[in-house]
């Protein structure tokens, strides 16, 4: 068997089972484990006089190792003393020695309860410049506690005069500070509070959590616009993850296809927002064939602050399709704005949601920018539905008075597009697409006066057309409102006007 | 193929701790985001704590200040050290592996270890 | 935190029945709804995961569906082996959850 140092045991009475008046008493140590022979055990009594007695070692048969027991009885006034038991293994090394201090009996004791508390961040979440720990020892026996702070398991140099000790009823409190620079607070590391009493280890840990509440994290995965399917013909995917906290680790995202094919370059961008919180969001193209023909497509993101890996998945919307119905409108010149109009795009009844809405004027697509489209909405039936509201000049109606509101979306036929055209005075201009034909629905322009209705292009509404009937969720001034009742006009005819 | 086997469980008296151990063999540890997993005798499945592949970590209310999930790739071991525990700790362990392209599950789970708190 | 609630606790059912076992969270889950299989002894089995997708190895009889709050297991024609305790998981640790377990349904033999 190789070299084995011991382990020492104090070996105690309980000290109620010890007479009040008895005038000696025997308390042990117990060395055990070691090898080779042998162990030499003195005792420290103090200024008690007192007489060793060692027992010749025994082996443990299991391992050959050694175990043997010194005994130390005294006499006189014991109860308030201590005893140190000095074990040393010449074999382990010349100075190898284990020093246990303790009393002759062993009262029963209520352990402490340890727990850290930290100091909170300011308002804004941010840590201040110093940290303050605080350790509390609760509830145990009144008796010597040794408290000791550790830093990633290393013991710290800290003042511990500033432990308080309190006593409530027949149980005592004692508590430690530990003050911490924000630096050493943010590297990451552990700290411990440990404390010893009646011979027995107690503690608890605490570090910095992780930068982000993981709850905040969201990764979103969005389907190609039906725009870049059909017209450009070179459709996207995109990956979003907000909402994270900008911190020393990336964000990984990996594309995969469920098909197990390779995908193609995906391009990133990070921004930073208002609010602290990063955005990352990275884009795929994918092939239009294969899109179509149902192909599933998986963003995979991992970050140091989600606790485990998100996977989002995308692929082409099953389910019934239906064509979506384009309404165009212009609302009438508004008091105080007669250089400008507001074109109105009612899209309704289309299956699935997925859709894009265009304007044009002079057979040239006016970008983006330029119209707000709500979020596809559902109607009462099965359908959704959209509006889209576009600005106009008084420059831009001079030049051609002819704007058109375009749909694209899978259902529509022959070209996966749908489109009216509207004009802001429809009277004077050359026949636009919506004098066609009698709309289902008439909007009606609800102004800040309830009047009689205004002609506009020398025609009426209705008598049963009337205002205020489901009022759309609408992007800003002015609020147009969706008559809900049919339009039974016998000749073809469009009416804006004043409510 | 892929084996997860828990170690570390038994009696424990109430106030003392112990350290589990989950052996990962099949495959790449660091890969994958790893799950510790309890239910008690008659019980459904509680969740504890995970360790991402990072080495971050995160555990249900319940179990923070008492629990502590750790991992180490080099020894294709992931750890769960219990202090102060308590009868209600008694349970089943299970480490189990989430799945490598996420949000997707625990698709491998070992045979658990029992932990018996009583004095 | 995103609770999981699942209903109803235990139903008995004979062998050939259809089974449906519900789940609802208390939030939208946006992906990485799992379900498990357990039996006795055992540890838990992944059934289905992402909503529907049947895990490598489960029978097609097995099936997923829901989204948002509400999810469903449906076990189309009961066989003497899927007598056991299933469980429903919110497996999307973005939206970090004590219990991200459901309670648990036991399938007996009626």
């Known amino acids: 068997a190789s070299t084995q140092s011991p382990s020492v045991f104090p070996l105690t009475r309980c000290c109620k089972n010890i007479p009040s008046n008895a005038t000696s008493v025997t308390l042990g140590c117990l060395a055990t484990g070691y090898f080779p022979e042998p162990v030499m055990v003195t005792w420290d009594t103090g200024s008690l006089n007192g007489t060793t007695m060692t027992l010749p070692a025994t082996t443990l048969t299991l391992s050959g190792h050694y175990a043997t027991i010194s005994l130390l009885t005294v006499s006189g006034a014991w109860a308030k003393q201590m005893f140190t038991c000095r074990v040393a293994h010449t074999p382990s090394s010349t100075d190898w020695v284990d020093n246990k201090t303790f009393s002759v009996c062993s009262r029963d004791f209520t352990p402490p309860t340890v727990k850290i508390l930290q100091s909170s961040c300011d308002g804004g979440g941010h840590f201040p410049p110093t940290i303050q720990l605080l350790c509390l020892v609760s509830g145990y026996t009144p008796g010597t506690i040794n408290i000791t702070w550790l830093e990633d398991g290393q013991v710290m140099d800290v003042d511990l005069s500033t432990a308080s000790t309190t006593q409530e009823g027949e149980l005592a409190s004692t508590q430690s500070e530990l003050t911490l620079s924000q630096k050493h607070w943010l590297s990451d590391r552990t700290y411990t509070c440990q404390v010893t009493y009646q011979g027995h280890t107690f503690e608890d840990s605490t570090k910095k959590c992780a930068d982000s509440n993981p709850r905040g994290v969201s990764a979103y995965l969005s389907r190609p616009s039906p725009f870049d399917l059909f017209i450009r013909k070179s459709p996207t995917i995109t990956c979003l993850v907000v909402d994270l906290a900008p911190s020393k680790g990336t964000v990984n995202l990996t594309w995969s296809r469920a098909s197990g094919k390779p995908v193609n370059h995906s391009t990133r961008k990070e921004e930073k927002q208002r609010n602290g919180t990063l955005t990352v969001t990275s884009t795929l193209p994918v092939g239009t064939r294969d899109w179509i023909e149902g192909e599933t497509y998986q963003c995979r993101v991992t970050h140091p602050h989600l606790p485990r890996a998100l996977m989002r998945s995308t692929t082409k919307t099953s389910g019934p399709r239906a064509a979506p119905e384009v309404y165009a409108f212009a609302t009438p010149e508004w008091p105080g704005s007669r250089d400008k109009r507001t074109l109105a795009c009612l899209i309704q009844n289309f299956m699935p949601e997925d859709i894009s809405v265009q304007w044009l004027h002079n057979e040239v697509q006016l970008p983006d920018a330029r119209h707000s489209t709500t979020q596809p909405r559902k109607t009462k039936g099965s359908g959704f539905f959209v509006f889209s509201r576009l600005e106009v000049t008084r420059a831009e109606w001079e030049q051609k008075d002819e704007f058109i509101c375009r749909a694209v979306h899978e259902a529509a036929s022959p070209s996966q597009t749908v489109q009216r055209a509207v004009s802001v005075n429809p009277g004077l201009a050359g026949g636009s697409a919506q004098s066609q034909r009698a709309p289902d629905r008439v909007l009606c322009h609800s102004g800040q006066q309830q009047g009689l209705p205004r002609a506009a292009g020398g025609s009426v509404p209705h008598p049963r057309c009337h205002c205020g009937a489901g009022r759309a969720d609408w992007p800003g001034p002015p609020e147009l409102d969706v008559c809900v009742e049919e339009a039974e006009g016998e000749a073809p005819w469009t009416w804006t006007g004043l409510c | 193929q892929v084996q997860l086997v828990e170690s570390g469980g038994g009696l424990v008296q109430p106030g003392g701790s112990l350290r589990l151990s989950c052996a990962a063999s099949?495959?790449?540890?660091?890969?994958?985001?790893m799950t510790w997993v309890r239910q008690a005798p008659g019980k459904g499945l509680e969740y504890v704590s995970i360790?991402?592949?990072?080495?971050?970590?995160w555990y249900a209310n319940w179990a923070s200040g008492r629990f502590t999930i750790s991992r180490d790739n080099s020894k294709n071991t992931v750890y769960l050290q219990i202090s102060r525990l308590r009868a209600e700790d008694t349970a089943t362990y299970y480490c189990?592996?989430?799945?490598?392209?996420?949000?997707?599950?625990?698709?491998?789970w070992g045979q658990g270890t029992l932990v018996t708190v009583s004095s | 935190d995103i609770q999981m609630t699942q209903s109803p606790s235990s139903v008995s059912a004979s062998v050939g029945d259809r089974v449906t076992i519900t789940c609802q969270a208390s939030?939208?889950?946006?992906?990485?709804l799992a379900w498990y299989q357990q039996k006795p002894g055992q540890p838990p089995k992944l059934l289905i995961y992402?909503?529907?997708t049947l895990a490598s190895g489960v029978p097609s009889r097995f099936s997923g569906s829901g989204s948002g709050t509400e999810y469903a297991l449906t076990i189309s024609s009961l066989q003497p082996e899927d007598f056991a305790t299933y469980y429903c998981?919110?497996?999307?640790?973005?939206?970090?959850?004590?219990?991200?377990f459901g309670g648990g349904t036991k399938v007996e033999i009626k």
């Open positions: 189990a592996r989430e799945t490598h392209h996420g949000s997707s599950g625990i698709d491998h």
């Open positions: 099949g495959f790449t540890l660091s890969n994958h985001d």
């Open positions: 360790i991402n592949t990072y080495g971050n970590h």
């Open positions: 939030e939208s889950i946006y992906s990485g």
């Open positions: 992402d909503h529907s």
């Open positions: 998981q919110h497996a999307d640790y973005a939206h970090h959850s004590d219990n991200v």
